[in-house]
């Protein structure tokens, strides 16, 4: 949560001389209450906009717009405090509109905008517009708040922003998961144009339950340049565990721009519909594919085995 770097923050408009200042989120009128205070904003509109920074990065910003009520209290309106609270971190950022001239009624409703709060993908924010001075203790509140959820990087508008591109948003793995005989899944996905490794996490769940009954991790080494954009096929061997039939496959890339924090893509295989006559399940499923001449554990994650190849 930050302010867009290079913009001259302007709030003046015809009939009003105004300046935008950084704020501590604690206006002086909290400490020294005034007798006469303005009413609250009439409406707040928030939408997402994309702006470029002085370094040429595209970043998501909140476009905040609000209007004034048409009452005499605008004569006592000295400005506004805009506050943005990131809900999952409780981080808050404020700016203050300081009116350098008195507001007068004119033929149109007064309208104000601010588009300089830089936000993060897939985060929820509470935006508050507080008219100044703030009300006396026990006075009627003169602020309005609205929550806004910034879309995640899957959203077409967000995909092209710098934070999303840095986390791998342009990569569409187009995952397909196919159930094979003998308790196996074939996972297929498209490799990106970077020589970096991938990790596949298979998590299995019982039907209708959310605690996992089996988890297996498979490592895919970095592809060679001629394999970029090709399909990679991985066969994962499942454990034959009672009722452990719903499988989620998650692919985590390790691109240089995002390392451990790249966007992960997943696909799910539902439990099969119960046939009228259940098919017999093989009674034995090896814990790992045996290595020749060894009864050691497969050097991979919890119980599962896998192999992969790339398709041109």
């Amino acid at each position: 949560l930050r302010l867009l770097d290079h913009r001259a923050l302007v709030c003046s408009q015809p009939g009003l001389n105004c300046t935008v200042k950084n704020s501590t989120c604690l206006d002086d009128s909290w400490i020294h209450p005034r007798n006469l205070t303005p009413s609250s904003p009439k409406n707040i509109y928030i939408n997402l906009s994309v702006s470029s920074t002085q370094h040429g990065e595209l970043v998501p910003v909140l476009h905040v717009e609000w209007t004034l009520q048409t009452d005499a209290s605008i004569l006592y309106l000295e400005g506004a405090e805009l506050s943005v609270l990131q809900l999952n971190t409780n981080e808050r950022l404020c700016v203050r509109f300081e009116f350098l001239s008195k507001l007068r009624h004119h033929h149109r409703r007064w309208r104000f905008t601010f588009s300089h709060f830089v936000v993060d993908p897939d985060q929820e924010y509470e935006v508050t517009v507080h008219h100044l001075p703030k009300p006396i203790p026990d006075g009627d509140p003169n602020h309005q708040s609205k929550n806004f959820l910034v879309p995640d990087c899957e959203h077409a508008r967000m995909k092209v922003t710098t934070p999303c591109m840095s986390s791998g948003s342009l990569w569409d793995p187009n995952i397909t998961v196919e159930t094979l005989e003998a308790h196996q899944l074939r996972v297929s996905f498209t490799l990106w144009n970077e020589s970096t490794h991938y990790q596949i996490l298979l998590t299995s769940f019982p039907h209708m339950e959310n605690h996992s009954c089996f988890e297996h991790m498979h490592h895919i080494p970095a592809p060679r340049p001629e394999e970029f954009h090709q399909r990679s096929n991985v066969t994962l061997t499942l454990r034959n565990l009672k009722g452990c039939c719903r499988h989620q496959v998650q692919i985590q890339p390790f691109f240089s721009s995002c390392l451990n924090d790249c966007l992960r893509h997943s696909a799910t295989v539902s439990c099969p519909e119960m046939p009228d006559t259940p098919e017999p399940i093989p009674d034995y499923m090896p814990l790992w594919e045996p290595r020749s001449g060894s009864s050691d554990y497969k050097d991979d994650d919890d119980k599962g085995s896998s192999h992969h190849h790339h398709h041109h």
């Epitope: 998590t203 605690h211 988890e215 565990l241 009672k242 009674d283 554990y297 991979d300 919890d302 119980k303």
Partner: antibody
């Protein structure tokens, strides 16, 4: 070589909480889940639950649900098991073990004594 | 939950003799069964997984067999270091459960 080293013995009063740690070394921590098993004095082994060191998924024994929390700190390759509202029948040696279903390496055990 | 029953509770055997330990599941656990050895004051040591596969470093005198509900751990010629308590454990279904143990003592 693979090692799981647990924190030292604890004496707690009924109603208190205990948090046992299990530091892993000799392998990639996030590749294998950590399970917890306990053994009351002179008794058999009892499975308590499991945590995925990669995803954080957990699966707890029904009888401990609501009292037990398993966590991991991947930066230090350490797993933790916290048991709350301790009772005298929670007196046991608590073991961490590697893997989810079948346990190939075990910690040395931590004796937790619950006594007023 | 699946109940694992081990028998006998105590087995008295002379060194060099064969020991046969039994483990029965209350319902089929396929071959998802492990055996552990535990000595006093020590953590359990893995012996067998998948009902019959020996774990790393386990001597060939230990062998496991069975599938479904009935399993056996056989120690072909007991050595002095084999006197201990042996546990079976199923991992076919949650919660994972252990048998009550069989104590193998010197006759």
């Amino acid at each position: 070589q693979v090692q799981l080293v647990q924190s030292g013995a604890e004496v707690k009063k009924p109603g208190a909480s205990v948090k046992v740690s299990c530091k892993a070394s000799g392998y990639t921590f996030t590749r294998y889940g950590i399970s917890w098993v306990r053994q009351a004095p002179g008794q058999g082994l009892e499975w308590m639950g499991w945590i995925s060191t990669y995803s954080g998924n957990t699966n707890y024994a029904q009888k401990l649900q609501g009292r037990v929390t398993m966590t991991t700190d991947t930066s230090t390759s350490t797993a933790y098991m916290e048991l709350r509202s301790l009772r005298s029948d929670d007196t046991a040696v608590y073991y961490c073990a590697r893997r989810q279903l079948y346990f190939d390496y075990w910690g040395q055990g931590t004796l937790v004594t619950v006594s007023s | 939950e699946i109940v694992m029953t081990q028998s006998p509770a105590t087995l008295s055997v002379s060194p060099g003799e064969r020991a046969t330990l039994s483990c029965r599941a209350s319902q089929s656990v396929s071959s998802n069964l492990a055996w552990f050895q535990q000595k006093p004051g020590q953590a359990p040591r893995p012996l067998i997984y998948d009902a019959s596969t020996r774990a790393t470093g386990v001597p060939a005198r230990f062998s496991g067999s069975g599938s479904g509900t009935d399993f056996t751990l056989t120690i072909s010629s007991l050595q002095s270091e084999d006197f201990a308590v042996y546990y079976c454990q199923q991992y076919d279904n949650w919660p994972l459960t252990f048998g009550g143990g069989t104590k193998v003592e010197i006759k």
